[in-house]
């Protein structure tokens, strides 16, 4: 008898404990990705940025994977998702093609199943860069709550990529679980 | 045979009521602290805030520690770090000695163990702000996820800090844990 | 007994299932409301938006209320809010009144029970959008982490509302509950 | 050092307008903002007016607007005060002074030039 | 604008002697943003203490300022006879920015 009870209660530690590791907030996927400025392209144009660490200084991912540029998702749920993009221009860095830039971050979703790619969130401003200053420097950062389903995928787009700040506190995006979907 | 099942199943409440607890969500760490503008520094270059409200308005705190300027992580893991500071300034509030202003903001992770700090988010703005508009305002806001260790403390550096906006919902900072780590 | 033993694990794994329906994270409450331009307030006085949607595209709510253009909050505990405001301004949609514009947000939590409303979180800038660019654009991200009870509720004024820019990427806001209050 | 002689100082009719300059050495001129602050015989100090490095904003008393310009020649490190329309209450020692440059709005003077008198009579 | 009134208009002290100067502003100066000038007759003034409390460079120890909000404080402790002068503060936390009429540390 007390034997069985033993069975008994182990059966229900050890669902519970399955339970607890599924609903654990350890299992929670994020990713926080920190440009990698090897490969900026140039130009004014809008661009994707591909080369993102994601495993060095601050940056960081789990339950998560970084492919061809783009951040997947491998777990359904609803996500914070955020970026902070930093440009800037300094004179010894050669004269600027136009005083008047748009300085533009997009946070685009692709689909595989359905190819398609939508903006989720973009962010910016029009900047008149003058010559008269030596610095120049401008921040975005946008964030918002949204639906991800396994196998969809993040990616960023801006223009001017050749004023990026390079720096990993400068120039990052990234995302984290906060609940399933109902 | 009765009380001996009883007392296995208190056992087995126990333990999970004690999981309970420790998971949670009201066990997680947090703050929200907000600008003291009673005693900012007047100079334009880069300076660490060190006044911050904890327990007035919208300011909080939870499983955290404010000291000597300073958030301090308690407990480890992986947390939201956010930041909004604004900077205005009007004719009255004095005379702009240059109209060329970099407006910025620094996140620093300080570790005592190995005495190191780090800029884990910045974000900002050069500005002209001209002497022909009585009044100029701009907000930076930055966020990003980091993973924390117990006893790392976080600070934040702001140039030109004698022009904060000294309002709760314009200049605060914050973190809140995510989740644990792996 | 043996029926007797199962039934006591039945009532411990129906009390833990309860415990766990309730910190399931499914059960956080969230909104992502996007801009409904129908019926944007023309002016560059300070309006409060009451126009977004809730239930199309990128927007969606749970265990929160939209009504009357506020995002009413139904279950107590502290949430992580956000907004980003973009405005934008091209030459084909007529002159500037005047080129001396500040483009803010304030998002406002108010209380029913002591009528009352108080802004949370603040950003914006003052801008000079002169006649010698043909478009502009500016956007605002602000986010921060607030004790919320049921019936508050919260709302976004902004300045300038006729530059506000429609798309649901560009001028949305947010919550989602990240813990209970202790 | 940084050294600040003014001059251009002298008697003049009511009504009537004089020029003072101040030559600045010793520092990065373009880079400070800088001011005019009087002192009338027997008494205390008054800020007059200041310019901002480049030149780009300027600031005036309310007891002179409309009547005095400031400007700078910053390839002459030179700061310059156009005072017209003259008035009595306008005699005074005129000293020219240098912003400390490490605040963002102008704030205390340092150090002074040692003062050119206006005198204003008929 | 702020008005700045400082007392006593005159102190008359010995060397040695610890001196006290007031200026209290008609209305709060933000930031502690206030400064402290010394000038003797014939010449220009010289800065003594800014924002509150900071000795300008070369000013020796004896020489500390205090306060914030409305009243401020100049202390010399030890009176040397080169000190005696016309002490002026001035506030920048608004514009314009404003002297105080002047405070006469005369030797007894």
């Known amino acids: 008898g007390s034997q069985h009870i033993r069975a008994e209660k182990a059966m229900v530690d050890g669902s519970w404990l399955d339970l607890a590791k599924r609903s654990k907030l350890e299992a929670q996927p994020f990713a926080h990705l920190t440009i990698n400025a090897t490969d900026i392209p140039s130009g004014s144009h809008k661009v994707s940025l591909s080369s993102w660490y994601h495993d060095r200084g601050w940056a960081k991912i789990s339950n998560m994977t970084f492919s061809n540029g783009k951040l997947i998702v491998n777990q359904d749920g609803f996500y914070y998702l955020y970026a902070n993009i930093c440009f800037r221009h300094h004179e010894t860095s050669g004269d600027l093609a136009t005083e008047y830039l748009q300085l533009m971050v997009y946070v685009t979703k692709t689909s595989i199943k359905i190819p398609s790619s939508h903006t989720l969130m973009k962010g910016g401003s029009t900047k008149y860069w003058s010559g008269n200053s030596e610095f120049h420097f401008y921040s975005i950062n946008v964030g918002g709550f949204f639906k991800l389903r396994s196998g969809e995928e993040i990616s960023i787009e801006v223009s001017n990529p050749s004023l990026l700040d390079p720096d990993q506190d400068a120039t990052y995006f990234g995302a984290f679980k906060v609940r399933d979907i109902d | 045979g009765s009380q001996h099942i009883r007392a296995e199943k208190a056992m087995v409440d126990g333990s999970w009521l004690d999981l309970a607890k420790r998971s949670k969500l009201e066990a997680q760490p947090f703050a929200h602290l907000t600008i003291n503008a009673t005693d900012i520094p007047s100079g334009s270059h880069k300076v660490s805030l060190s006044s911050w409200y904890h327990d007035r308005g919208w300011a909080k705190i939870s499983n955290m520690t404010f000291s000597n300027g300073k958030l301090i992580v308690n407990q480890d893991g992986f947390y939201y770090l956010y930041a909004n500071i604004c900077f205005r300034h009007h004719e009255t509030s004095g005379d702009l000695a240059t109209e060329y202003l970099q407006l910025m903001v620094y996140v620093t992770k300080t570790s005592i163990k190995i005495p190191s700090s780090h800029t884990l988010m910045k974000g900002g703005s050069t500005k002209y702000w001209s002497g022909n508009s009585e009044f100029h305002f701009y907000s930076i806001n930055v966020g990003g996820f980091f993973k924390l260790r117990s006893g790392e403390e976080i600070s934040i550096e702001v140039s030109n800090p004698s022009l904060l906006d000294p309002d709760q919902d314009a200049t605060y900072f914050g973190a809140f844990k995510v989740r644990d780590i792996d | 007994g043996s029926q007797h033993i199962r039934a006591e694990k039945a009532m411990v794994d129906g009390s833990w299932l309860d415990l766990a329906k309730r910190s399931k994270l499914e059960a956080q409450p969230f909104a992502h409301l996007t801009i409904n331009a129908t019926d944007i307030p023309s002016g560059s006085h300070k309006v409060s938006l009451s126009s977004w949607y809730h239930d199309r595209g990128w927007a969606k709510i749970s265990n929160m209320t939209f009504s009357n253009g506020k995002l009413i909050v139904n279950q107590d505990g502290f949430y992580y809010l956000y907004a980003n405001i973009c405005f934008r301004h091209h030459e084909t949609s007529g002159d500037l009144a005047t080129e001396y514009l500040q483009l803010m947000v304030y998002v406002t939590k108010t209380s029913i029970k002591i009528p009352s409303s108080h802004t949370l979180m603040k950003g914006g800038s003052t801008k000079y959008w002169s006649g010698n660019s043909e478009f502009h654009f500016y956007s605002i991200n602000v986010g921060g982490f607030f004790k919320l009870r049921s019936g508050e509720e919260i709302s976004i004024e902004v300045s300038n509302p006729s530059l506000l820019d429609p798309d649901q990427d560009a001028t949305y806001f947010g919550a989602f509950k990240v813990r209970d209050i202790d | 050092e940084v050294q600040l002689l003014e001059s251009g100082g002298g008697l003049v009719q009511p009504g009537g307008s004089l020029r003072l300059s101040c030559a600045a050495s010793g520092f990065t001129f373009s880079s400070y903002a800088m001011s005019w602050v009087r002192q009338a015989p027997g008494k205390g100090l008054e800020w007059v007016s200041g310019?901002?490095?480049?030149?780009?904003?300027?600031y005036y008393a309310d007891s002179v607007k409309g009547r005095f310009t400031i400007s700078r020649d910053n390839s002459k490190n030179t700061l310059y005060l156009q005072m017209n329309s003259l008035r009595a209450e306008d005699t005074a020692v005129y000293y020219c002074?240098?912003?400390?440059?490490?605040?963002?709005?102008?704030?205390?003077?340092?150090?002074w030039g040692q003062g050119t008198l206006v005198t204003v009579s008929s | 604008e702020i008005v700045l009134t400082q007392s006593p208009g005159t102190l008359s002290l010995s060397p040695g002697e610890r001196a006290t100067l007031s200026c209290r502003a008609s209305?709060?100066?933000?930031?502690?943003?206030l400064a402290w000038y010394q000038q003797k007759p014939g010449q220009a003034p010289r800065l003594l203490i800014y924002?509150?409390?900071s000795r300008a460079t070369g000013i020796p120890d004896r020489f500390s300022g205090s306060g914030s909000g409305t009243d401020f404080t100049l202390t010399i402790s030890r009176l040397e006879p080169e000190d005696f002068a016309v002490f002026y503060c001035q506030q920048y936390g608004s514009s314009p920015r404003t002297f105080g009429q002047g405070t006469k540390v005369e030797i007894k």
């Open positions: 924002q509150g409390s």
């Open positions: 002074a240098k912003d400390p440059g490490t605040t963002v709005i102008m704030s205390w003077f340092d150090p």
């Open positions: 209305q709060s100066v933000r930031g502690r943003y």
């Open positions: 310019i901002t490095g480049s030149g780009g904003s300027t």
